[in-house]
């Protein structure tokens, strides 16, 4: 299987992980976290990094603690620098993580999913149009 396809699988997998965590929002620490929305073009990987850095935590209420912790850790899996660094030249102009509006876990996860969907769509579009820069 090609690297491009594996990359898409990983991105879709992240959406599934977000969906799984959404089932457990009541078991997450109700902390407000930076949640990028309407991310400007070329800042997607920067925003992705902000989501990964956010301190999403299990409330340690017991029952679902294991699956929550495993899922959060998988959500933080780092993509290769070839992907994350593609937009490096634009990174200086992207907003800092702290500048994004802070939201509780439910909205945080919804916005993360929205960004992932956008990135997948962009990736597919760039492949369709033969562009390397995706």
């Amino acid at each position: 299987m090609q690297g491009q396809d594996r990359h898409m699988i990983r991105m879709r997998q992240l959406i599934d992980i977000v969906d799984q965590l959404k089932n457990y929002v009541n078991d997450l620490v109700p902390e407000f976290l930076p949640a990028p929305e309407d991310v400007e073009t070329n800042c997607e990987w920067s925003a992705f990094s902000c989501f990964q850095k956010a301190q999403l935590k299990s409330a340690n209420t017991g029952n679902n603690e294991r699956i929550i912790n495993v899922s959060i850790k998988k959500l933080k899996r780092k993509p290769p620098s070839t992907n994350a660094g593609r937009r490096q030249k634009h990174r200086l102009t992207c907003p800092s993580c702290d500048s994004y509006e802070k939201k509780p876990p439910k909205e945080f996860l919804e916005r993360f999913k929205s960004l992932l969907q956008k990135m997948i769509h962009q990736h597919l579009s760039s492949r369709t149009h033969g562009s390397e820069d995706s």
Partner: antibody, heavy 126, light 106 residues
């Protein structure tokens, strides 16, 4: 080929200890999380413990928490299960299994246990 | 913690017949997190289906998985003699197994 081989099982008295080993070959051991799963005679599968690919996190079933310790030595391609304060209800075949989700972004992506050993039998009896 | 309930406990069928095995979760499960295993007597389990619907490497296409949310199904379209075994569903991440369904020869 990809292979897991368990060892260290045997007959032990209640309250005693035993250490199981699982030797891995045919794949990059340090890129995969690993599990122990057990099966009591005539019963279903019971997940026992999981260790992250780099040993950074460990998880245990409530039934073994505080008594069993999972560990790994990536330089030796080996997974371990230290079992203390053994009870009769720990009698089972113990399997090690590879977690199918590789730490490598471009690696395997299966949310499941995709490679299993043949199992080693632990009998706790006085 | 999530509980996975498999039904029926035992399924008695003849070779060539269709087998439908059910796995019901006590809470919603994201489809990526649902796996199925086959275990034959005296053997280790083997991964059949991951992500609720995807066949693991080397698994024949007579095996298929479906479902979402709390209800999942493993279907064996035409039973071969080697398919008579015990089947387990599992939630990834909590790694909880269902109690198993035995598919036996009628």
């Amino acid at each position: 080929q990809v292979q897991l081989v368990e060892s260290g099982g045997g007959v032990v008295q209640p309250g005693r200890s035993l250490r199981l080993s699982c030797a891995a070959s045919g794949f990059t051991f340090s890129s995969y999380g690993m599990h122990w799963v057990r099966q009591a005679p005539g019963k279903g599968l019971e997940w026992v413990a999981f260790i992250w690919y780099d040993g950074s996190d460990k998880y245990y079933a409530d039934s073994v928490k505080g008594r069993f310790t999972i560990s790994r030595d990536n330089s030796k391609n080996t997974l371990y299960l230290q079992m203390n304060s053994l009870r009769a209800e720990d009698t089972a075949v113990y399997y090690c299994a590879r977690d199918g989700d590789s730490s490598d972004w471009y690696g395997d992506y299966y949310f499941g246990m995709d490679v299993w050993g043949q199992g080693t039998t632990v009998t706790v009896s006085s | 913690e999530i509980v996975l309930t498999q039904s029926p406990g035992t399924l008695s069928l003849s070779p060539g017949e269709r087998a439908t095995l059910s796995c019901r979760a006590s809470q919603s499960v994201s489809s990526s997190y649902l796996a199925w295993y086959q275990q034959k007597p005296g053997q280790a389990p083997r991964l059949l289906i991951y992500g609720a619907t995807s066949r693991a490497t080397g698994i024949p296409d007579r095996f298929s998985g479906s479902g979402s949310g709390t209800d999942f199904t493993l279907t064996i379209s035409r039973l071969e003699p080697e398919d008579f075994a015990v089947y387990y569903c599992q939630q990834y991440g909590s790694w909880t197994f269902g109690q198993g369904t035995k598919v036996e020869i009628k």
